[in-house]
């Protein structure tokens, strides 16, 4: 028995930040679980981890250079990524493992979300067009 995961097919990070919501076919209330977000087709880079425990606050962990936070819903975990770079445009996969109560569960691999990071373009403000020729 596997947990199904739904993700948006594509998100655009205009301001170098994005909310990626992982929706599960499973209620996470009062469960001990590990939800993670992985970058790349091979999922080789673990971007962010959210630990849920029925008795403690949510713990969020990231050590791969990503600025990450997490929020828990009844059947979802939302990863909030900030300070993204254009070269971090990639496909991102949600993953989850539920430890307690038994039985142990994990997810079917999702289709992933392509996060397209748009670079910040510095444009001259129309209020201050710069020096004009005399």
């Amino acid at each position: 028995n596997k947990i199904l995961v739904k993700q948006s097919p594509m998100l655009v990070a205009y301001d170098n930040a994005v909310n990626l919501s992982c929706k599960y076919s499973y209620n996470l209330f009062s469960r001990e679980f590990r939800a993670s977000l992985h970058k790349g087709l091979d999922s080789a880079v673990e971007v962010c981890v959210v630990y849920g425990n029925y008795s403690q606050q949510l713990q969020v962990y990231s050590k791969t250079g990503f600025n990450c936070d997490g929020k828990l819903g009844n059947e979802s975990v939302t990863f909030y990524l900030q300070n993204l770079y254009v070269n971090q445009t990639d496909i991102y996969f949600c993953k989850i493992e539920v430890m307690y109560p038994p039985p142990y569960l994990d997810n079917e691999k999702s289709n992933g979300t392509i996060i397209h990071v748009k670079g910040k373009h510095l444009c001259p403000s129309p209020l201050f067009p710069g020096p004009s020729k005399p």
Partner: nanobody, 124 residues
């Protein structure tokens, strides 16, 4: 609880190779992710590599990618770390770790049990 016994550490010259082994006894070995951490003198223990319960996926610290390879043999309850192109900065005590999870082991929160560690020294 699982008992973990490491072997294969030693002194090697820069550019050389070592193969670490970690034999597990106790808990069902094949049901959990396994991995390696290391601790250099005066530094925190850091993640090196891990492998999923069925060997289906592996994770590596950026600094060791392309040089280190983790593998496991569930019939022998053993996990291996093949270390090639060793550098002086790889000098550390290497610890085997058993995860609480089937597919995940990348940080302290994931570790259920530690081995005693084996010293790896790379001379220049």
């Amino acid at each position: 609880e699982v008992q973990l016994v490491e072997s294969g550490g030693g002194l090697v010259q820069a550019g050389g190779s070592l193969r670490l082994s970690c034999k597990a006894a106790g808990r069902t070995f094949s049901s959990y992710a396994m991995g390696w951490f290391r601790q250099a003198p005066g530094k925190e223990r850091e993640f090196v590599a891990s492998i999923e319960w069925d060997g289906g996926g592996a994770y590596y610290e950026e600094a060791v990618k392309g040089r280190f390879t983790i593998s496991r043999d569930n019939t022998k309850n053993t996990v291996y770390l093949q270390m090639d192109s060793l550098r002086p900065e790889d000098t550390a005590v290497y610890y085997c770790a058993a995860s609480r999870w089937r597919t995940a082991l990348t940080n302290y929160y994931d570790v259920a049990d530690w081995g005693q560690g084996t010293q790896v020294t790379v001379s220049s």
